[in-house]
């Protein structure tokens, strides 16, 4: 098959490769304080850490991505850690009419992979 | 809205962002000769280049993730580019009766954004 | 419909602890933050704590702290609210509420556990 | 914390007239968007709470227009313009500026 087998665990140690990690953000820093009421706090899930050879491949073209970075490093860049999946998340927010709630389906990360 | 307008032109200078770039490749350069037997050589299209800010963005969580990185640039690593779209691609390969025909669905990249 | 489905009631002695259940049915459980408040026999409410199913990430009243610990699972859609060192004073009914963060709007509630602390 | 105080303690009315209940908070609910960060449950009896109004006066989904939240800072107040039976139960007041949240300690509602 196309597929090598992707690998789970990390050989660059605990940490290291690419994993969800919550990052905690205001309305401000994200620059959205003048339209969304709530939350005013946010719990960000987001993709971070390296993708060794192999690691969590996303598909085969990571798999091929992975092997050409390994014979050409500068030509091929290594896979990345991007979501592969996402969790919707509710916002309230200002509108013309007042305050109405939307659900967001691509705003924070629900898991990751290499691609 | 949640989706500020996603940046088109690069702003570091042409070829340096996020773009589909083709890369051959042989058949041992994948490690596939011994089960591919045709195309010997591929043509395959790689997502390359960087992601500067707001450069292609995927959706929401890369906007948001381009947002943080400014901010905390250790902490929230920049979006990288990635495939946003494949094009099929038959093999012809080996099998215990012979020899067949496979399509491929994530083998090559079609389209490239910044996730 | 989306329903909040607590755990049922519970009888425990002083010193002990309790673990309530509030399972989310019909909806999308990591879109919101989970609260729980209670409510002592004809008194009124009182915010314990709250969790963000999404990360994990716990919030509690210094009043409850290190007394209480709120968890979520998300691959079964359920929070818990475990509560230790039980006195008659937690002799009370336990709900859990979805709300927006800690921001309010807690628009749906469960139907509350009620815990009974006697000796 | 913030504190909350509600008056009345209790509040008996006649259906078809108007009823108002006042909240009282120890620190100013007003955000720095403009929006104050106060909410009005309902809790009839034997039932868990509804959320009626949220961010000092926006009507929860379903909640009849008879009800408005009005307000700001530290003085808030709900009222009902024509008390049904269905009326009836403990009203409270919640902050959610800053955690811990707190409640108001209630006032009943009931039919003369």
């Known amino acids: 098959s196309a597929h090598a087998h992707p690998r789970d665990s990390c050989p660059l140690g605990p940490g290291r490769c690419c994993h969800l990690e919550t990052v905690q953000a205001t309305l401000e820093d994200l620059g959205w304080s003048d339209w969304v009421l709530s939350p005013r706090q946010l719990q960000l899930s987001m993709c971070v850490g390296e993708c060794p050879h192999l690691y969590r491949s996303a598909n085969t073209h990571a798999q091929i991505k992975a092997r050409l970075h390994g014979l050409q490093p500068d030509k091929v860049p290594a896979p990345c850690c991007v979501p592969s999946s996402y969790t919707p998340v509710v916002l309230m927010h200002r509108t013309d009419s007042g305050v109405s709630l939307q659900t967001y389906d691509d705003l924070v990360a629900r898991g990751c992979h290499c691609a | 809205s949640a989706h500020a307008h996603p940046r088109d032109s690069c702003p570091l200078g042409p070829g340096r962002c996020c773009h589909l770039e083709t890369v051959q490749a042989t058949l041992e350069d994948l490690g596939w000769s011994d089960w591919v037997l045709s195309p010997r050589q591929l043509q395959l299209s790689m997502c390359v280049g960087e992601c500067p800010h707001l450069y292609r963005s995927a959706n929401t969580h890369a906007q948001i993730k381009a947002r943080l990185h400014g901010l905390q640039p250790d902490k929230v690593p920049a979006p990288c580019c990635v495939p946003s779209s494949y094009t099929p691609v038959v093999l012809m390969h080996r099998t215990d009766s012979g020899v067949s025909l496979q399509t491929y669905d994530d083998l090559v990249a079609r389209g490239c954004h910044c996730a | 419909q989306v329903q909040l489905v607590q755990s049922g009631a519970e009888v425990k002695k002083p010193g002990s602890s309790v673990k309530v259940s509030c399972k989310a049915s019909g909806g999308t459980f990591s879109s919101y933050y989970i609260s729980w408040v209670r409510q002592a026999p004809g008194q009124g409410l009182e915010w314990m704590g709250g969790i963000a199913p999404i990360s994990g990430t716990a919030s509690y009243a210094q009043k409850f702290q290190g007394r209480v610990t709120i968890t979520a699972d998300e691959s079964t859609s359920t929070a818990y609210m475990e509560l230790s060192s039980l006195r008659s004073e937690d002799t009370a009914v336990y709900y859990c509420?979805?709300?927006?963060?800690?921001?309010?709007?807690?628009?749906?509630w469960g139907r509350g556990t009620l815990v009974t602390v006697s000796s | 914390d913030i504190v909350m105080t509600q008056s009345p303690l209790s509040l008996p009315v006649t259906p078809g007239e108007p009823a108002s209940i006042s909240c009282r908070s120890s620190q100013s609910l007003l955000y720095s968007n403009g929006y104050n960060y106060l909410d009005w449950y309902l809790q009839k009896p034997g039932q868990s709470p509804q959320l009626l109004i949220y961010l000092g006066s926006n009507r929860a989904s379903g909640v009849p227009d008879r009800f408005s939240g009005s307000g700001s800072g530290t003085d808030f107040t709900l009222k009902i313009s024509r008390v049904e039976a269905e009326d009836v139960g403990v009203y409270y007041c919640m902050q959610a500026i800053g955690v811990p949240l707190t409640f108001g300690g209630g006032t009943k509602v009931e039919i003369k």
């Open positions: 509420a979805r709300g927006l963060a800690y921001d309010g709007y807690f628009d749906l």
